[in-house]
Interface confidence: low
């Protein structure tokens, strides 16, 4: 899919546009919200019911290239108790983001935008039981 | 910036880093993942900890529209389907990277921007703090 | 030419029913999504509600939500409000609009087009 | 009851500039941009304003738009006698899960 053009019948698009080749844009890498910070609360992975662990992939020609993935601990939720309760299911909660691949074609190099689907956390849900007839 | 292996057969002048401003192609790469989390599951009403998902719509953004979770208790769902406060809802965040037209309503020049999204909701054990 | 062309409105009793249609003409209509927006007399604005494009996502005014149903025809260039369970503060000149822009968007762009309106009126 | 409030009434006379506001909350204006209609008496509501104040084509520029935090403005300069109209701002509101609209402002040119 590409990038769209702001889609509107009346839009004029400003002077100040930077030219641009077909088929192509023009992105700046310099992050905006750089330094914005997650104020999750402390542990979720460890203290939630469908706790989950973290690891951190790594590729050198993506940007960003550390992207963290989670994983459930479990397949069913931990209950009051602590022990693991399988009629309940841990899931995972994904969430696209996109990243900028670089790609090597002999000595020159291209860049691409990627979406890339990170999972975030788990949460713990009620199965869906399919009866057979 | 990030560090890259080079072709020993290449010219010695690209950066080892990222360069600050890139010409991307248009076209995405596995761009026809499901972004509308209503119709990717229903986790949002099944989960013990349910969320809301309200629309964010911008289009001087790409994706122009997110969805942001919002939990709907404080506290989790019991077996019998009741409110229990002994456990709390708490929303799992995420950082992700979105795009920006910079300058503002131009249609093939954008810069990252990282946004802070509330994906969904999960269930956790309260921290008590004892007074001594 | 941009046009929408509201039609089905009349007198009826409340707790019955109307189908209220929207005939579009002059663009891609399965490309924008749709609202419909009414005005009792000598009132205000009140939406009422929205179609995505593809009419896979609708909303709802809480006024209206379980009585009234969204829906489009692609093919036929058509929108519709099925409206039951009327009640007289459903009195109202019914429009229907087009977002202003094309895709997934119900409302940055406003709504550019309006129909004419329809009236309803609901009495015994 | 309207979630997003307006003066019921705003008057000048011919070339005065005249300011209608529209005040919201977090869940309406505070996260969405606004639009702004106006509705002659007897006719369909036009569109004014978009996105807080981008005027769609054909809308002179005497009519500017501004949005901050959780309030915006509509600002008519240079009054005419065919500003006499109801104006109405809107956005989404993620509370309520819907598009909503001001209670509307009645503009009277005096004289």
């Known amino acids: 899919r590409k990038i769209p053009k702001v889609g509107h019948t009346f839009f004029q698009k400003p002077e100040s546009c930077p030219p641009v080749p077909g088929g192509s844009m023009k992105l700046d890498i310099g992050i905006i919200n750089e330094n914005q910070r997650v104020s999750m609360s402390r542990n979720i992975e460890s203290r939630s019911t469908s706790p989950w662990n973290y690891t951190v992939t790594w590729d050198p020609n993506r940007y960003p290239s550390e992207v963290v993935q989670a994983q459930c601990r479990n397949l069913g939720c931990i209950n009051a108790q602590g022990k693991e309760d399988i009629s309940m299911n841990s899931v995972p909660i994904q969430q696209e983001t996109l990243v900028v691949r670089r790609k090597h074609q002999g000595c020159s190099v291209s860049f691409q935008l990627e979406k890339v689907l990170v999972t975030v956390g788990c949460t713990c849900v009620t199965p869906v039981i399919h009866h057979v007839q | 910036g990030i560090t890259i292996p080079r072709n020993p057969g290449c010219p010695n002048s690209e950066d080892k880093n990222f360069p600050r401003t890139v010409m991307v192609n248009l076209n995405i790469h596995n761009r026809n993942t499901n972004t509308n989390p209503k119709r990717s599951s229903d986790y949002y009403n099944r989960s013990t900890s349910p969320w809301n998902l309200h629309r964010n719509e911008d289009p001087e953004r790409y994706p122009s529209v997110i969805w942001e979770a919002k939990c709907r208790h404080l506290g989790c769902i019991n077996a019998d389907g009741n409110v229990d406060y002994h456990m709390n809802s708490v929303p799992i965040q995420q950082e992700i990277l979105v795009l920006r037209r910079e300058p503002p309503h131009c249609p093939n020049s954008f810069r990252l921007e990282k946004i802070l999204v509330s994906v969904g909701c999960t269930c956790v054990t309260p921290i008590v703090h004892h007074v001594a | 030419e941009v046009q929408l062309l509201e039609s089905g409105g009349g007198v009826v009793q409340p707790g019955r029913s109307l189908r209220l249609s929207c005939a579009a003409s002059?663009?891609?209509?399965?490309?924008?999504?749709m609202h419909w927006v009414r005005q009792a007399p000598g009132k205000g604005l009140e939406w009422v509600a929205v179609?995505?494009?593809?009419?896979?996502?609708?909303y709802y005014a809480d006024s209206v939500k379980g009585r009234f149903t969204i829906s489009r025809d692609n093919s036929k260039n058509t929108l519709y409000l099925e409206m039951n369970s009327l009640r007289p503060e459903d009195t109202a000149v019914y429009y229907c609009?087009?977002?202003?822009?094309?895709?997934?968007?119900?409302?940055?762009?406003?709504?550019?087009?309006w129909g004419q309106g329809t009236t309803v009126t609901v009495s015994s | 009851q309207s979630v997003l409030t307006q003066p019921p009434s705003a008057s000048g006379t011919p070339g005065q500039t005249v300011s209608i506001s529209c005040s919201g909350s977090?869940?309406?204006?505070?996260?969405?941009?606004v639009d702004w209609y106006q509705q002659v008496p007897g006719a369909a509501p036009k569109l004014l304003m978009y996105?807080?104040?981008y005027r769609p084509s054909g809308v002179p520029d005497r009519f500017s738009g501004s949005q901050s935090g959780t309030s915006a403005s509509l600002a008519i300069s240079g009054l005419q006698s065919e500003d006499e109209a109801d104006y109405y701002c809107?956005?989404?509101?993620?509370?309520?899960?819907?598009?909503?609209f001001g209670s509307g402002t009645k503009v009277t040119v005096l004289g």
């Open positions: 609009a087009k977002v202003g822009a094309s895709g997934d968007y119900y409302y940055s762009y406003g709504l550019d087009v």
């Open positions: 002059g663009f891609i209509f399965s490309n924008y999504g």
């Open positions: 179609i995505s494009y593809d009419g896979s996502n609708k």
């Open positions: 977090h869940s309406n204006i505070g996260r969405h941009p």
């Open positions: 996105y807080g104040g």
């Open positions: 809107a956005t989404w509101d993620d509370r309520l899960v819907g598009y909503v």
